[in-house]
C-alpha cells in the first residue's frame, strides 16, 4: 500500500540537493582560504539534521544552530551590502566590488542560494515533490527559517555604515514584509551601526525622479531613526555600469578606488 504523503503548495526540494550543497561547500572552501578548515561533510550532516525527519511546518532557528556553528565566518562588518528585491544586481555589484559582501557571498548564504528543501515527519526522506509555501502553508518551513536565521545573524554582525540596495522599479521600494524589512532592519545593532545608507536603483533610462522621497522610503527612515541609527538614501541612476563590469570584472572602471 503506497504511503500517504502530504501535498504542499510550494515546489519540492531542488533536484540533487545533497550533491549540490556538498559541491558548493567544496567549491567555496577552495576559493576562500579563510574557510579551508571547514569539513564539508560535517556541514552537510548539520544541514540535513536541521530538517530531516522533522515536520516541515515546525522548524525552529534552534534546528539550524549546529549548521550556524560550523558555518561561522567573519566578514568585514563595515563592508556589508544588504538587498531587497534586487538580488541579481546586488550580487553583480559585489562580484565587482570585491571588498563588499552580501549574505550570499558568505558560506551559508552561498550554499542555500536559490535552493528549496524540506523533509517529512518521522522519515529520513527528502521531499522532492512539494514543500510548504510561506503564504499558503506555513512560515516555519525549512527554507524560510534558514533565511530568517542567517539574515538575522548577518545583520547583527554589521557595523559602521551598512548599505542596502533597493529596487526603484517596484511599487513598494521598501517592503516591510521582505526579509530585509522584517528581519535585517530590526537586527542591526544601534551600538555598532552608525548609518544605514539605501541605494535606490533606477530602472528607466530617462528617469530623473527622486525616489528617496517615496513613502516607503520615508517609512524605512522612520523605522531606522527610531532605532537610533542614522539613515541616508541615494538615487542611483546608472546600474548599467555594474553590468558592464560583470562582463569585464578586471577592468579599471570596476573599482571605486580612484
Amino acid at each position: 500500500v503506497p504511503r500517504w504523503r502530504q501535498q504542499w503548495s510550494g515546489p519540492g526540494t531542488t533536484k540533487r540537493f545533497p550533491e549540490t550543497v556538498l559541491a558548493r561547500c567544496v567549491k567555496y572552501t577552495e576559493i576562500h582560504p579563510e574557510m579551508r578548515h571547514v569539513d564539508c561533510q560535517s556541514v552537510w550532516d548539520a544541514f540535513k539534521g536541521a530538517f530531516i525527519s522533522k515536520h516541515p511546518c515546525n522548524i525552529t532557528e534552534e534546528d539550524y544552530q549546529p549548521l550556524m556553528k560550523l558555518g561561522t565566518q567573519t566578514v568585514p562588518c563595515n563592508k556589508i551590502l544588504l538587498w531587497s528585491r534586487i538580488k541579481d544586481l546586488a550580487h553583480q555589484f559585489t562580484q565587482v566590488q570585491r571588498d563588499m559582501f552580501t549574505l550570499e557571498d558568505t558560506l551559508l548564504g552561498y550554499l542555500a542560494d536559490d535552493l528549496t528543501w524540506c523533509g517529512e515527519f518521522n522519515t529520513s526522506k527528502i521531499n522532492y515533490q512539494s514543500c510548504p509555501d510561506w503564504r499558503k502553508d506555513c512560515s516555519n518551513n525549512p527554507v524560510s527559517v534558514f533565511w530568517k536565521t542567517v539574515s538575522r545573524r548577518f545583520a547583527e554582525a554589521a557595523c559602521d555604515v551598512v548599505h542596502v540596495m533597493l529596487n526603484g522599479s517596484r511599487s513598494k521600494i521598501f517592503d516591510k514584509n521582505s526579509t530585509f524589512g522584517s528581519v535585517e532592519v530590526h537586527n542591526l545593532q544601534p551600538e555598532k551601526v552608525q548609518t544605514l545608507e539605501a541605494w535606490v536603483i533606477h530602472g528607466g533610462r530617462e528617469d530623473s525622479r527622486d525616489l528617496c522621497q517615496d513613502p516607503t522610503i520615508k517609512e524605512l527612515e522612520s523605522i531606522i531613526s527610531k532605532r537610533n541609527i542614522q539613515f541616508s538614501c541615494k538615487n542611483i541612476y546608472r546600474p548599467d555600469k555594474f553590468l558592464q563590469c560583470v562582463k569585464n570584472p578586471e577592468d579599471s572602471s570596476c573599482t571605486s578606488e580612484i
Epitope: 566590488q97 525622479r209 528617496c212 522621497q213 541615494k234 555594474f242 558592464q244 577592468d251 572602471s253
Partner: antibody
Framework: QVQLVESGGGLVQPGGSLRLSCAAS????????MNWVRQAPGKGLEWVSY????????NYADSVKGRFTISRDNSKNTLYLQMNSLRAEDTAVYYC?????????????WGQGTLVTVSS | DIELTQPPSVSVAPGQTARISCSGD??????VYWYQQKPGQAPVLVIY???KRPSGIPERFSGSNSGNTATLTISGTQAEDEADYYC??????????FGGGTKLTVL
C-alpha cells in the same frame, strides 16, 4: 596613466560648425561613460553631453540639444562632439571628461581643454 | 531640475579651516562631487561620493552632505589651496549640474 587630449577647437562664425575630438589613453576607453563639459571665459563649468560605453545612449544639456551630437569610436579610443548652428554663447573652453566608476556619476579625469570661439 | 547654489567667494587665513557650501533641494538624496580649478588649468576632482577622497588628494580636504547642503571643508588651509571650487551632482537623465563656483582666497 590616464590621458585625455582634446583637439579641433578654433575660430568659427555664428551658424558655422566644428567637430571636436578627444583622444583617450591609459585606460579601457570602451568601459566608461564619457562627457563634454564647457567653460565660457570667466564663467563656471557647464555640463554639455554624455555618452554611455557602447555609444547607444546619449544625453544633452537643454542649451545644446538639437545642435550638438556626441559620439565615440571605441576602436580608436576617441570621443567626438559635432557642433552645428554655433552661437556666440557657445564660446568656451571645451573639456572632455571621464566618468567615475560604479555608483558614482562625476568626473574622475579631465583633458586640458580646447578653445572654441564663435565670432563674426 | 535641481539647482546648486554656492557662495561666490570665501576667504580664510592660512592654517585656518575653510568651509564652502553647496545647497539644493533634497541634495542629501544625491551624491555630490567637488572640483578644484586653478587659473588656466583643468578642474581636478578633490571629493567624490559626498566624502571620499581620490588618491593623491591631501587629507585636509573632506566633504559632507546632509539636508539640503553639501560642504567642502579644507582644514589647515594652505596658500596652494587658493582656487575656484565647484560642486556637482547628477539627478538622472540630462540633469548633470554644477554649482556656480566659489573663489577661495587664502589671506
Amino acid at each position: 596613466q590616464v590621458q585625455l587630449v582634446e583637439s579641433g577647437g578654433g575660430l568659427v562664425q555664428p551658424g558655422g560648425s566644428l567637430r571636436l575630438s578627444c583622444a583617450a589613453s591609459g585606460f579601457t576607453f570602451s568601459s566608461y561613460y564619457m562627457n563634454w563639459v564647457r567653460q565660457a571665459p570667466g564663467k563656471g563649468l557647464e555640463w554639455v553631453s554624455y555618452i554611455n560605453p557602447n555609444g547607444m545612449m546619449t544625453n544633452y544639456a537643454d542649451s545644446v540639444k538639437g545642435r550638438f551630437t556626441i559620439s565615440r569610436d571605441n576602436s580608436k579610443n576617441t570621443l567626438y562632439l559635432q557642433m552645428n548652428s554655433l552661437r556666440a554663447e557657445d564660446t568656451a573652453v571645451y573639456y572632455c571628461a571621464r566618468d567615475l566608476p560604479l555608483v558614482y556619476t562625476g568626473f574622475a579625469y579631465w583633458g586640458q581643454g580646447t578653445l572654441v570661439t564663435v565670432s563674426s | 531640475d535641481i539647482e546648486l547654489t554656492q557662495p561666490p567667494s570665501v576667504s580664510v587665513a592660512p592654517g585656518q579651516t575653510a568651509r564652502i557650501s553647496c545647497s539644493g533641494d533634497n541634495l542629501r538624496h544625491y551624491y555630490v562631487y567637488w572640483y578644484q580649478q586653478k587659473p588656466g588649468q583643468a578642474p581636478v576632482l578633490v571629493i567624490y561620493g559626498d566624502s571620499k577622497r581620490p588618491s593623491g588628494i591631501p587629507e585636509r580636504f573632506s566633504g559632507s552632505n546632509s539636508g539640503n547642503t553639501a560642504t567642502l571643508t579644507i582644514s589647515g588651509t594652505q596658500a596652494e589651496d587658493e582656487a575656484d571650487y565647484y560642486c556637482q551632482t547628477y539627478t538622472g537623465g540630462a540633469s548633470l549640474v554644477f554649482g556656480g563656483g566659489t573663489k577661495l582666497t587664502v589671506l
